[in-house]
């Protein structure tokens, strides 16, 4: 079952997600998507990192933590009721089926 996080309309929501890089800057690709984690990748991707940097995001979605040290927690700016739902943080470790998947439930009040 998903861990639940709450935010108020008009505020910023924070969805935590972390991993430990082998070394600072030795990054593992991460994707964030709206909806539960599918078998592979993320559905409805809102933000993505690669081995080097944050390489894709859409307006309102950003990383407030030190992603190069494994803090890939998602900030959603100025949330509305439509932002309620499940979000997937998927840490894409190398190798088959090695991904770490986290489903986080965002409740907007």
């Amino acid at each position: 079952s998903e861990v639940e996080y709450r935010a108020e309309v008009g505020q910023n929501a924070y969805l935590p997600c972390f991993y430990t890089p082998a070394a600072p800057g030795n990054l593992v690709p991460v994707c964030w998507g709206k909806g539960a984690c599918p078998v592979f990748e993320c559905g409805n991707v809102v933000l993505r990192t690669d081995e080097r940097d944050v390489n894709y995001w859409t307006s309102r979605y950003w990383l407030n933590g030190d992603f190069r040290k494994g803090d890939v927690s998602l900030t959603i700016e100025n949330v509305t009721l439509a932002d309620s739902g499940i979000y997937c943080c998927r840490i894409q470790f190398p190798g088959l089926m090695n991904d770490k998947k986290f489903n986080l439930k965002l409740v907007i009040k």
């Epitope: 800057g25 944050v54 307006s59 990383l63 700016e77 100025n78």
Partner: antibody
Framework: QIQLVQSGPELKKPGETVKISCKAS????????MSWVKQAPGKGLKLMGW????????TYADDFKGRFAFSLETSASAAYLQINNLKNEDTATYFC??????????????WGQGTTLTVSS | DIVMTQSPATLSVTPGDRVSLSCRAS??????LHWYQQKSHESPRLLIK???QSISGIPSRFSGSGSGSDFTLSINSVEPEDVGVYYC?????????FGGGTKLEIK
């Protein structure tokens, strides 16, 4: 292609106000912050701060609090730098530069051509 | 604020030389260090990010190294078009300070 186009040179007197524009094209304006950088004649680069283009929230470096204001016209994909009560030491070239919104991503990958401001009585 | 110190202030080189520009931070900034080139009467251009990551469109003769507080920008074989001022930038802590620059001249 991505471009940041700034307004033209300005000649002002001390005490006056100037507003410099930076018009973005080639990308979704609200997905990147906009930074402002000052370069005094013959000197180096100094970050003034940046503005979140989605929320409009500005962040100012300590040396640029008070007389300086960042603003937006999102519908025109434009950012603005206003300097009030101009002083001679404001004479400089001002650059806008694109910055990703993420807290630890602070390189500036695209720059405007610069706007030269001369303040002289 | 983090102080970024660059050396030397001016470097006079011959085309074909390999050159190294130094940048030192007043405290550790991990690898949050970016390099820019500014040619006369032009805007700065991003050369290297995160101390050593290459940027699309930048010639491969430019490379960066370092971590913590000591960083180096290397130009493998200097060309006449490389003249300009090179700035390092602290990308770790606001206000993301720049170094004073190293001016590269051709003899």
């Amino acid at each position: 292609q991505i471009q940041l186009v700034q307004s033209g040179p300005e000649l002002k007197k001390p005490g006056e106000t100037v507003k410099i524009s930076c018009k973005a094209s080639g990308y979704t304006f609200t997905t990147y912050g906009m930074s402002w950088v000052k370069q005094a004649p013959g000197k180096g680069l100094k970050l003034m701060g940046w503005i979140n283009t989605y929320s409009g929230a500005p962040t100012y470096a300590d040396d640029f609090k008070g007389r300086f204001a960042f603003s937006l016209e999102t519908s025109a994909s434009a950012a603005y730098l206003q300097i009030n009560n101009l002083k001679n030491e404001d004479t400089a070239t001002y650059f806008c530069a694109r910055k990703p919104p993420h807290y630890y991503v602070n390189s500036f990958d695209y720059w405007g051509q610069g706007t030269t401001l001369t303040v002289s009585s | 604020d983090i102080v970024m110190t660059q050396s030397p202030a001016t470097l006079s080189v011959t085309p074909g030389d390999r050159v190294s520009l130094s940048c030192r931070a007043s405290q550790s900034i991990s690898d949050y260090l970016h390099w820019y080139q500014q040619k006369s009467h032009e805007s700065p251009r991003l050369l290297i990010k995160y101390a050593s990551q290459s940027i699309s469109g930048i010639p491969s003769r430019f490379s960066g190294s370092g971590s913590g507080s000591d960083f180096t920008l290397s130009i493998n074989s200097v060309e006449p078009e490389d003249v300009g001022v090179y700035y390092c930038q602290n990308g770790h802590s606001f206000p993301y300070t720049f170094g004073g620059g190293t001016k590269l001249e051709i003899k």
